[in-house]
């Protein structure tokens, strides 16, 4: 009778074990072990027992002890079970950003590991078990489907293997994959709203606003605003699930023409874009040209209005004949024309919009001086000791200086309240002087003496 000890062994891969082969007869003809494993016999006294060290056990094995006794030959097997944790526990790669509402398939692959009967694969979200299955196949593969929700944002998914050797008196061996952090997002199907001027004048600034509602997580949204090749630098304001990006856009003569304004919102691995065309135009104010801005009375004056070649002008409300970018009028300057405004209005059509520009010039007409009976009466008769205000108004441009002198020495206080005395009586020479010349007019003051009874 041949026996073996131990009859069952569980050992780590590459480990060693001592196996004792015994026989019941005292003088066996043969006593040995049959195994492909490297073996080393340990010397013991006696003939009916042998101890072997089996090493580098890589896989399950069944070494067999045998003995040949007078009563016959017999064998006994020992069962060596090798255990090892998986060499690879991996979640199949996935894009980190996943849209809310999508079915996400998590796939865990496990390579190696034994004994398989004791090996379980667990899929987790955080610490919560999603699926538990025995490891089957090589590699073993376990899958589960998750419906992506908003509250999954930032959650860690992982795969764990459990090699449970506790029934064999050993422990529970766990291996965990690298976590996959899920980033969930909502990007609505509606494109962003883009508000901007349809036309923009060269050397001016416009404001562009791009906004979108219903985003999650809004802080992760990237906004790209551009006009043609010019990248804009917006100021972004965030709401709970919305943003508004505001940017100033400056355009120069080089940008003239039709430009494409784009607003792109990128969230996760998706994007939404809105395009709009902006027409950049150059339209200087019309030019009002006076032959001379300051002329003397009676001078012929030409007023010209010149504008952008495609503009249509009106000069003082009168359209150019024929309708176009130039208009002019001729006039003979009169005092009434002093301070007269000549206004040129130009209209240009840009991308279906009418743009208006105005320019005004004022004409100064130099005239005078003038002194006439209506504004400077030639005769005053006032009672002695009464309060009177001598009035004499000179007209002209520039406004003349007026002095009324009696005998070249006594001034008459024009516009002042005076007490009438005998000294005031007499003939005054009123002189109105300006750069345009001088006019004189005689004014007589008569003083009535009070009658005494």
């Amino acid at each position: 009778q041949t026996s073996v000890s131990p009859s069952k062994v569980i050992l780590p891969r590459g480990g060693s074990v001592l196996v004792t082969c015994s026989t019941s007869c005292d003088q066996p003809k043969l006593l040995g072990i049959e195994t492909p494993l490297p073996k080393k016999e340990l010397l013991l006294p006696g003939n009916n027992r042998k101890v072997y060290e089996l090493s580098n056990v890589q896989e399950d094995s069944q070494p067999m002890c045998y003995s040949n006794c007078p009563d016959g030959q017999s064998t006994a097997k020992t069962f060596l079970t090798v255990y090892w944790t998986p060499e690879r526990v991996e979640l199949a790669p996935l894009p980190s950003w996943q849209p809310v509402g999508k079915n996400l398939t998590l796939r865990c692959q496990v390579e190696g590991g034994a004994p398989r009967a004791n090996l379980t694969v667990v899929l987790l979200r955080g610490e919560k078990e999603l699926k538990r299955e025995p490891a089957v196949g090589e590699p073993a593969e376990v899958t589960t489907t998750v419906l992506v929700r908003r509250d999954h944002h930032g959650a860690n998914f992982s795969c764990r293997t459990e090699l449970d050797l506790r029934p064999q008196g050993l422990e529970l061996f766990e291996n965990t994959s690298a976590p996959y952090q899920l980033q969930t997002f909502v990007l609505p199907a509606t494109p962003p709203q883009l508000v901007s001027p349809r036309v923009l004048e060269v050397d001016t600034q416009g404001t562009v606003v791009c906004s979108l509602d219903g985003l999650f997580p809004v802080s992760e949204a990237q906004v790209h605003l551009a006009l043609g090749d010019q990248r804009l630098n917006p100021t972004v304001t965030y709401g709970n699930d919305s943003f508004s990006a505001k940017a100033s856009v400056s355009v120069t003569a080089e940008d003239e023409g039709t430009q494409r304004l784009t607003c792109a919102v990128i969230l996760g691995n998706q994007s939404q874009e809105t395009l709009q065309t902006v027409t950049i135009y150059s339209f200087p104010a019309p030019n009002v040209i006076l032959t001379k801005p300051e002329v003397s009375e009676g001078t012929e004056v030409t007023v010209k209005c010149e504008a952008h070649p495609r503009a249509k002008v009106t000069l003082n409300g009168v359209p150019a004949q024929p309708l176009g970018p130039r208009a002019q009028l001729l006039l003979k300057a009169t005092p009434e024309d002093n301070g007269r405004s000549f206004s040129c209005s130009a209209t240009l059509e840009v991308a279906g919009q009418l743009i208006h520009k105005n320019q005004t010039r004022e004409l100064r007409v130099l005239y005078g001086p003038r002194l006439d009976e209506r504004d400077c009466p030639g005769n005053w008769t006032w009672p002695e000791n009464s309060q009177q205000t001598p009035m004499c108004q000179a007209w002209g441009n520039p406004l003349p200086e007026l002095k009324c002198l009696k005998d070249g020495t006594f001034p008459l206080p024009i516009g002042e309240s005076v007490t009438v005395t005998r000294d005031l009586e007499g003939t005054y020479l009123c002189r109105a002087r300006s750069t345009q010349g001088e006019v004189t007019r005689k004014v007589t003051v008569n003083v009535l003496s009070p009658r005494y009874e």
Partner: antibody, heavy 116, light 110 residues
Framework: SVEESGGGLVKPGGTLTLTCTVS????????MGWVRQAPGKGLEYIGI?????RTYYASWAKGRFTISKTSTTVDLKITSPTTEDTATYFC??????????????WGPGTLVTVSS | AYDMTQTPASVEVAVGGTVTIKCQAS??????LSWYQKKPGQRPKFLIY???KLASGVPSRFEGSGSGTEFTLTISGAQSDDAATYYC????????????FGGGTEVVVK
């Protein structure tokens, strides 16, 4: 322009006539005045002859000074001068016509010294 | 009588400083007042007429104001060249007067 002449040394009690010669304007349309400044003293108004030939004097000057004119000259006659009359005498156009050009037309002045 | 009283008789001012000279008429002369600058050995220079109007060529640092009986000449940002005696003169009445001129104000610029 206006220019005074006739100044110099005169004895107290004598008679002295200063002449103001004008050019570039007509005396028939301008008043002419006389002003003096004694050494270390202020400007002192003497009198004026109007465009109508009428004369006006400072109260202290009446009887001691006489102003008269021809077509191109204005005279100031000093009767019985005293040492108090030692001064520079200026001839002035339009002293009361205070336009921008008024009172700018002053002669350079002529010095009268009254001394025995 | 239209007598003119000028104050002060003398005033000292630093370069860049401001001088104010007052002139008072014994009765209203409306705005018929002129100001002159007089330097020794030179004819008087016409500065201001009609109380506040600047004669041509006169720097804007000279300013006249007032009407009726009270008048003022102000020199702002005085220059060394402004050292002189300044006179006011009424240009309203040429008869029955003692003197058409004020007594003068000597301005010394330090």
């Amino acid at each position: 322009s206006v220019e005074e002449s006739g100044g110099g040394l005169v004895k107290p009690g004598g008679t002295l006539t200063l002449t103001c010669t004008v050019s570039g304007f007509s005396l028939s349309s301008h008043a002419m005045g006389w002003v003096r400044q004694a050494p270390g003293k202020g400007l002192e108004y003497i009198g004026i002859i109007g465009s109508s030939d009428r004369t006006y004097y400072a109260s202290w000057a009446k009887g001691r000074f006489t102003i008269s004119k021809t077509s191109t000259t204005v005279d100031l006659k000093i009767t019985s001068p005293t040492t108090e009359d030692t001064a520079t005498y200026f001839c002035v156009r339009d002293p009361y016509d205070s336009y921008d050009d008024g009172y700018r037309l002053w002669g350079p002045g002529t010095l009268v010294t009254v001394s025995s | 009588a239209y007598d003119m009283t000028q104050t002060p008789a003398s005033v000292e001012v630093a370069v860049g400083g401001t001088v104010t000279i007052k002139c008072q008429a014994s009765q209203s002369i409306y705005r018929y007042l002129s100001w002159y600058q007089k330097k020794p050995g030179q004819r008087p220079k016409f500065l201001i007429y009609d109380a506040s109007k600047l004669a041509s060529g006169v720097p804007s640092r000279f300013e006249g104001s007032g009407s009726g009986t009270e008048f003022t000449l102000t020199i702002s940002g005085a220059q060394s060249d402004d050292a002189a005696t300044y006179y006011c003169q009424q240009a309203y009445s040429s008869g029955s007067i003692d003197n058409a001129f004020g007594g003068g104000t000597e301005v010394v610029v330090k």
